[in-house]
């Protein structure tokens, strides 16, 4: 692999990371917008930080940091930055794989935990504005009502529920959506993992090439 290959590798890594950095900026920006303008509220009282805005801000920030390391490491041919980029991608990849395995193994436990959290939040609907905002947003957006159905609202469905007839529950609808789109979710997840592995491979190859080039030049 010569100087031309090194240049190609360097610019491929740079441009792809620049693209991801821009995406990260957009995600972060959207997250900040949600935090400022849209009060989707808090659905799980035991996880008050788990809001749509916070999720976007965290994901956007991680993408930006990783992509920045990739951009700067490749364009400056900085081994330290490239290794940091490689290690961060490895940590993210391992975390994703671990999370996927845990979700698969503990799906039933997770379902029970989420259902319990949602039941608790239904009881807080009339007393907590943040919970009310969260439920109203979800019920209006998904055209659903309650957890498993309209009857979950034992003291009557709120105005955000479809009023004319009973509809399926929001959790039931979300689970159904996930199950019916399982193939697409799987493909997207695999694509993300492949991109991460490619990024790691490129970073490692570029790192090795920097070493070889340095030796060839006699540094």
């Amino acid at each position: 692999m010569g100087m031309s290959s090194l240049k190609l590798l360097k610019y491929v890594l740079f441009f792809f990371n620049l693209l991801f950095w821009i995406c990260g900026c957009c995600i972060l920006g959207f997250g900040i917008y949600l935090l400022i303008h849209n009060n989707f509220g808090v659905l799980f009282h035991n996880l008050p930080s788990l809001t749509l805005g916070n999720v976007f801000v965290i994901v956007g920030s991680i993408i930006m940091v990783v992509a920045f390391l990739g951009c700067m490491g490749s364009i400056k041919e900085n081994k330290c930055l490239l290794m940091s980029f490689f290690i961060l991608l490895l940590i993210i990849l391992l975390a994703e794989v671990t999370l996927a395995i845990l979700l698969f193994v503990y799906e039933q436990k997770l379902n029970e935990y989420v259902a319990k959290g949602l039941t608790d939040s239904i009881h807080r609907y009339h007393s907590d504005n943040s919970t009310k905002a969260a439920w109203d947003s979800i019920q209006s957006f998904l055209q659903c009502c309650g957890i498993n159905g309209t009857s979950d609202w034992t003291s009557g469905p709120p105005a955000s529920c479809p009023s004319d007839r009973k509809v399926e529950g929001c959790y039931a609808k979300a689970r159904l959506w996930f199950h019916s789109n399982f193939l697409y979710i799987g493909i997207i997840t695999i694509c993300v993992c492949v991109i991460e592995v490619l990024g790691m491979s490129f970073a490692l190859t570029l790192n090795c090439q920097i070493d070889k080039t340095s030796q060839t030049i006699g540094l």
Epitope: S140, W153, P162
Partner: antibody, heavy 111, light 112 residues
Framework: QLQQSGAEFVRPGASVKLSCTAS????????IHWVKQRPEQGLEWIGR????????EYAPKFQGKATITSDTSSNTAYLQLSSLTSEDTAVFYC??????WGQGTTLTVSS | DIVMTQAAFSNPVTLGTSASISCSSY???????????LYWFLQRPGQSPHLLIY???NLASGVPDRFSGSGSGTDFTLRISRVEAEDVGVYYC?????????FGTGTKLEIK
């Protein structure tokens, strides 16, 4: 389909309980509504019940006048009307899912 | 309560031609979820009412596709493309956005 109880002829001041039995579907799957139609007039929504949890809602006009109940074991809903006057002379329909209407129960209040 | 307004009678129509029945509400019947909660019912002489159109434009099961519903948030129209003798009766619009649900006074379809 929805099968309603037969015509009722009652005295003013009395109470009456109308029934509505469903067949071919489970009433728990949607609301049961009751609708009033006075002779040669339009339709008025009395109220509804969610048979799955017993929750009821009434139009303000019928609050205190009407009581809606249900029995899921017999797939039946009920409408009880109290302190009857000539104004209560009407046909009462039970409705499920807004798709299924009973044949109507004629209530005549007269002395 | 949301008041629903309807004309008592339609313009007399000839069998086989189209007819339109109008209905209006004093406030928008469109929910935050984008659905417009306007229903149409037909009550034939001596019968119980039955559902024709739900949520403004959806045809109820078993209803011929001669019937169609349209409208904005406050003004609604029921169209019958080719009127048949069995379409005679009183047409009621109803709002299902807020409790108490309210019906229009009904429009009687007249045949020439």
């Amino acid at each position: 389909q929805l099968q309603q109880s037969g015509a009722e002829f009652v005295r003013p001041g009395a109470s009456v309980k109308l029934s509505c039995t469903a067949s071919g579907f489970n009433i728990k799957d949607d609301y049961i509504h009751w609708v009033k139609q006075r002779p040669e007039q339009g339709l008025e929504w009395i109220g509804r019940i969610d048979p799955a949890n017993g929750y009821t809602e009434y139009a303000p006009k019928f609050q205190g006048k009407a009581t809606i109940t249900s029995d899921t074991s017999s797939n039946t809903a009920y409408l009880q009307l109290s302190s009857l006057t000539s104004e209560d002379t009407a046909v009462f329909y039970c409705v499920w899912h807004w798709d299924y209407w009973g044949q109507g129960t004629t209530l005549t209040v007269s002395s | 309560d949301i008041v629903m307004t309807q004309a008592a009678f339609s313009n007399p129509v000839t069998l086989g031609t189209s007819a339109s029945i109008s209905c209006s509400s004093y406030k928008s019947l469109q929910h935050n979820n984008g659905i417009t909660y306007l229903y149409w019912f037909l009550q034939r002489p001596g019968q119980s009412p039955h559902l024709l159109i739900y949520r403004m434009s959806n045809l109820a099961s078993g209803v011929p596709d001669r019937f169609s519903g349209s409208g904005s948030g406050t003004d609604f129209t029921l169209r019958i493309s080719r009127v048949e003798a069995e379409d005679v009766g009183v047409y009621y619009c109803a709002q299902m956005l807020e409790r108490p649900f309210t019906f229009g006074t009904g429009t009687k379809l007249e045949i020439k």
